[in-house]
């Protein structure tokens, strides 16, 4: 007999994992057997849909791969002509372990300002979201919070917030964790300690200090008088992002110099100044120590001989040191003019290196004496007939004045640098000239007092200023 | 040739004093600058003090104030007194002769500071 | 004062073969008006006195052997041992006499296989 369709066990609520396999059973009793059909939404699942298998005539329907979008109500109508259709509806509830859909970036931030980390995520049940700092769980605090998007918010960030972030998805069928992003937090170039005025002595060697910090860490330029430093010697050090600068300067006028402390945010700088006074005080007696000051030579008759910039010893046993040393030169050079072309040079080299001494700078100034090797070389080899002359003249009164006595050094007296290297000076001219003393012909038949030892090659033999001493 | 020979260590205690000295011979002694250097059992070599040919002198921050480096040109003789000694001083005292290098070094003398 | 930090802080090596020790110093230690480096090399072996070996950064002193040599400038310095042979075996400072407190290198000991 006909029979009009029953529904014998309706459709119920269908939980199921993205691409997993979730099927709805629609059972039905007729007769003659129904045509059955579905749909979700409300919208008809044809049959020839690639995605879905329907079997057992109709009351089988199988999802083949669940994706998130098949979330819905899913209905059955069961129709045989006899009697009215019947339906039969149930939800398919897609559940999604948690998924990280657009996670957090590497950041960059200028501390103060407002940054946020995105962590925007999908997953049913809804996950929750959390962040981890380092290896530890992030706390939330009045400037710190986690948005209702899972986003990370950081109000006022401070040098402190800096580090490495990630964020975790979590719901009950697992968790997702983001990739590490680094937030750097970046700080406005800041001087913290200012180069300080001073008021010195013309010939003094000063040192302005600067200090500076930011992130990533300043870079210190020196201008003096609004333009770049063109003299001194600049020492730099860089601990725990602050960069200290010490600028070394002669004194030989007066001068604004000014610190800038300079660091780059993406295309933008940040720039920090402070500058300082230096002038020059009169000239006041120096210390009981203190023989003398450091000065760059600016005299005329020994520019050719002393190393381009040379620091030398200025006496201040002499009332106007430059003057008196220039003055001792130029007449110990007016004598020089009638000797042999083979002592002149030599002669001229141990006038000037004697009477402008080569200087150590340092909280006492000292001169750097000749080494005595070079003076012998003078005196016995480049110019032994007119030292004896010289010393003959010496001795029987025939010079002036002492000034000249002064002029020549004692060789005797000087360090040597077969004892210590570091103690004297050499001079470059000497070796030079000593390449040629084999085409000279022997200037003295007597033996020389004192075995000349090799003069070391020029590559060895620049202009030594020895370097400071520092007291403190 | 250049010969340094330093004497006047020994055992001394705590925030006692010792007084060092070095006889150069074979060079000039008074053109040169002088130093002392020390080196404590199994360590390295640490500098304490350097004299300029006028008698300036210099010191490391570490013995700054206890030690006092002097020289006397006419007996060639350079000194280092070593005043208010502790543990931490024990260490061979090494006399050396150099300006900005360290040339010509004694064999060294033995301090000991323990109770 | 003054850092110098040498390394490595030991090395092993066989007869013959080229040992390189680095000294770095927290600051420059040449001058402006000279460009001279104010670095030191020193030799001590086992139970002597020090020996200065490179003064002026690449200067070699009197009466060292060719194969020890200095090359450096500012605040990175080198000390080379072409060749290094039996005798040399010792501990090597580094030392810089540009600004007092004058101040060493932690040393660097070079052992023979």
């Known amino acids: 007999l006909p029979k009009a369709p029953v529904i014998t066990t309706p459709l119920e609520t269908v939980d199921a994992l993205v691409e997993e396999v979730a099927t709805f059973m629609c059972a039905v009793e007729s007769y003659p057997q129904p045509e059955i059909s579905w749909t979700r939404n409300k919208i008809l699942i044809k049959l020839f849909d690639t995605r879905y298998s329907i079997r057992e005539n109709g009351q089988l329907l199988t999802i083949l791969s669940v994706e998130d979008s098949d979330d819905g109500i899913y209905c059955c109508t069961a129709n045989n002509g006899v009697g009215g259709a019947v339906e039969s509806c149930g939800a398919l509830q897609v559940k999604m372990k948690p998924k990280i859909t657009r996670p957090p970036i590497n950041v960059k931030i200028i501390e103060g300002l407002k940054a946020v980390l995105p962590c925007t995520t999908m997953g049913n049940p809804k996950p929750s979201v959390s962040w981890i700092k380092g290896d530890s769980p992030l706390r939330e605090n009045s400037r710190i919070a986690v948005l209702e998007s899972g986003s990370l918010r950081i109000h006022n960030v401070q040098k402190e917030d800096a580090g490495q972030y990630r964020c975790v998805a979590k719901n009950s069928l697992g968790t997702a964790y983001s990739k590490v992003v680094k937030l750097e937090v970046e700080v406005f170039a800041r001087i913290l300690r200012a180069p300080e005025s001073h008021n010195v002595t013309f010939g003094s060697f000063v040192t302005l200090h600067c200090t500076a910090t930011g992130i990533p860490v300043p870079t210190i330029t020196w201008i003096e008088n609004g333009n770049a430093v063109s003299s001194g010697s600049i020492q730099e050090s860089v601990k725990d992002r602050v960069i200290d600068s010490r600028l070394q300067l002669f004194i030989t006028k007066p001068g604004l110099y000014t610190c800038i402390a300079t660091n780059k945010h993406g295309e933008k700088f940040s720039t920090a100044k402070a500058a300082a006074t230096i002038s020059i005080a009169e000239w006041s007696k120096p210390q009981k120590d203190n023989k003398g000051y450091c000065a760059q030579y600016r005299g005329e008759v020994c520019n050719a001989v002393l190393a381009k910039d040379a620091l030398v010893f200025l006496n201040t046993s002499y009332a106007d040191p430059e003057e008196a040393q220039e003055l001792l030169v130029h007449t110990a050079w007016n004598e020089l003019k009638v000797v042999s072309p083979v002592c002149r040079p030599a002669a001229e080299a141990l006038l000037c290196n004697h009477i402008f001494q080569e200087c150590s700078p340092g909280v006492v100034p000292t001169p750097i004496p000749i080494c005595r090797e070079y003076c012998l070389a003078v005196k016995e080899l480049f110019c032994a007939k007119e030292w004896l002359v010289m010393e003959e003249k010496t001795h029987r009164g025939l010079y002036r004045s002492e000034m000249h006595l002064l002029s020549v050094p004692e060789c005797s007296k000087l360090p040597s640098m077969h004892w210590d290297p570091t103690a004297c000076a050499r001079l470059p001219h000497l070796d030079y000239n000593k390449e040629n003393l084999k085409t000279f012909p022997p200037m003295t038949s007597s033996k020389p007092s004192v075995d000349i030892p090799n003069l070391p090659s020029s590559s060895s033999s620049s202009f030594s200023v020895s370097p400071t001493y520092s007291m403190t | 040739e250049v010969q340094l020979v330093e004497s006047g260590g020994g055992l001394v205690q705590p925030g006692g004093s010792l007084s060092l000295s070095c006889v150069a011979s074979?060079?000039?002694?008074?053109?040169?600058?002088m130093n002392w250097v020390r080196q404590a059992p199994g360590k390295g070599l640490e500098w304490l003090s350097v004299?300029?040919?006028?008698?300036?002198?210099y010191y490391a921050d570490s013995v700054k104030g206890r030690f006092t480096i002097s020289r006397d040109n006419v007996k060639n003789t350079l000194y280092l007194q070593l005043n208010n000694l502790k543990p931490e001083d024990t260490a061979l005292y090494y006399c050396?002769?150099?300006?900005?290098?360290?040339?010509?070094w004694g064999q060294g003398t033995q301090v000991t500071v323990s109770s | 004062e003054i850092v110098l930090t040498q390394s490595p802080n030991s090395v092993t090596a066989s007869v013959g073969e080229k040992v390189t020790i680095n000294c770095k110093s927290s600051?420059?230690?040449?001058?402006?008006?000279?460009?001279?480096?104010?670095l030191n090399w020193y030799q001590q072996r086992p139970g002597q006195s020090p020996r200065l070996l490179i003064y002026?950064?690449?200067t070699q002193q009197s009466g060292i052997p060719d194969r020890f040599s200095g090359s450096g400038s500012a605040t990175d310095f080198t000390l080379t041992i072409n060749s290094v042979q039996p005798e040399d075996a010792a501990v090597y400072y580094c030392?810089?006499?540009?600004?007092?407190?004058?101040?060493f290198g932690q040393g660097t000991k070079v052992e023979l296989k």
């Open positions: 074979g060079f000039t002694f008074s053109l040169y600058y």
């Open positions: 030392q810089q006499g540009y600004s007092a407190p004058f101040t």
């Open positions: 050396v002769l150099g300006r900005t290098a360290l040339v010509r």
């Open positions: 600051q420059r230690v040449q001058l402006g008006s000279n460009q001279k480096s104010y």
């Open positions: 002026y950064a690449s």
């Open positions: 004299i300029d040919t006028h008698s300036i002198a």
